[in-house]
């Protein structure tokens, strides 16, 4: 067990803070909840503290919760491939470029680390080149979320990882908006981290609303499990 992994044996409170600017539309989001890495479970609630969110909530899910991939459940035989927990408590910087097909892009930079007993994800997001009446700024996405696989590989040069995946957002007219994610994680501290073999995270997310919440908000339940690395031969012959 990595030292960082010991911090995730129980339920951990999570705080998310985002400052965003998309095509000049500035906004802030605060989120709170908890994560339980034993089950790969996240429960979070987010509010837009600046009024109505100028982009659809589903376009921010990867920035919020795929931001705290340290809560992914890594099976016993894969624990030596869990970069995310190994970087804790000092944490990691997570940078992404998200290309929305036939539309604009988000660039995000986040610091994910422990502040006291709370895992904090502080994010800056800049979005450019979006069409004012496109699927994103035109709010044409359905309020739901598909399951995805998130592919992880080591980046030995940077002592971190590179991550690629493609999100499929459902559009109200029945079509799909693709969002290509290119992600890089580097540790904040200078302690040892686990550099993984290639594998993937399998994610399932459910979006809902709190009927008593008056502010523009999103409630998120997510389960994430690491997969893609089989047991070693010695395991098979036990």
């Amino acid at each position: 067990m990595s030292k960082g992994e010991e911090l995730f044996t129980g339920v951990v409170p999570i705080l998310v803070e985002l400052d965003g600017d998309v095509n000049g539309h500035k906004f802030s989001v605060s989120g709170e909840g908890e994560g339980d890495a034993t089950y790969g479970k996240l429960t979070l609630k987010f509010i837009c503290t600046t009024g109505k969110l100028p982009v659809p909530w589903p376009t921010l899910v990867t920035t919020f919760s795929y931001g705290v991939q340290c809560f992914s459940r890594y099976p016993d035989h894969m624990k030596q491939h869990d970069f995310f927990k190994s970087a804790m408590p000092e944490g990691y910087v997570q940078e992404r470029t998200i290309f929305f097909k036939d539309d604009g892009n988000y660039k995000t930079r986040a610091e994910v680390k422990f502040e006291g007993d709370t895992l904090v994800n502080r994010i800056e997001l800049k979005g450019i080149d979006f069409k004012e009446d496109g699927n994103i700024l035109g709010h044409k996405l359905e309020y739901n979320y598909n399951s995805h696989n998130v592919y992880i590989m080591a980046d030995k040069q940077k002592n971190g990882i590179k991550v690629n995946f493609k999100i499929r957002h459902n559009i109200e007219d029945g079509s799909v908006q693709l969002a290509d994610h290119y992600q890089q994680n580097t540790p904040i501290g200078d302690g040892p981290v686990l550099l993984p073999d290639n594998h993937y995270l399998s994610t399932q997310s459910a979006l809902s609303k709190d009927p008593n919440e008056k502010r523009d908000h999103m409630v998120l339940l997510e389960f994430v499990t690491a997969a893609g690395i089989t047991h070693g031969m010695d395991e098979l012959y036990k």
Epitope: L15, S30, E32, K45, I47, D210, N212, K214, R215
Partner: nanobody, 119 residues
């Protein structure tokens, strides 16, 4: 557990002002005021985040009511100006353990017993 005690309620003329106080027995996160008129559900009025960077008010009180807090005294205040008969209710102070300001009752961990405001 944190105890919350409200004070400052009373009878006031329409157009008048009142300042409610809520003293907490220890540090809290976000704090808010809710109100409940006879025969109606308890509703969020206004609140302030634990970091004091975020305040929010329902439309019916915006521009008339102000929430502020004194973290040294563990106290939150509700300044109510230009009071209207429809503001008549029992006003409850609520607090969260954590800092984010939500408006849903179910997000609040601690509640006061309430103070009556009659306009």
């Amino acid at each position: 557990d944190v105890q919350l005690v409200e004070s400052g309620g009373g009878l006031v003329q329409a157009g008048g002002s009142l300042r409610l106080s809520c003293a907490a027995s220890g540090p809290t996160g976000a704090m808010a005021w809710f109100r409940q008129a006879p025969g109606k559900e308890r509703e969020f009025v206004g609140g302030i985040s634990g970091s004091e960077t975020d305040t929010y008010y329902v439309d019916s009180v915006k521009g008339r009511f102000t929430v502020d807090r004194d973290n040294v005294k563990n106290t939150v205040y509700l300044q109510m100006n230009s009071l209207k008969p429809e503001d008549t209710a029992v006003y409850y102070c609520a607090a969260r353990r954590r800092i984010t300001l939500f408006t849903s009752r179910t997000d609040y961990d601690f509640w006061g017993r309430g103070t009556q405001v009659t306009v």
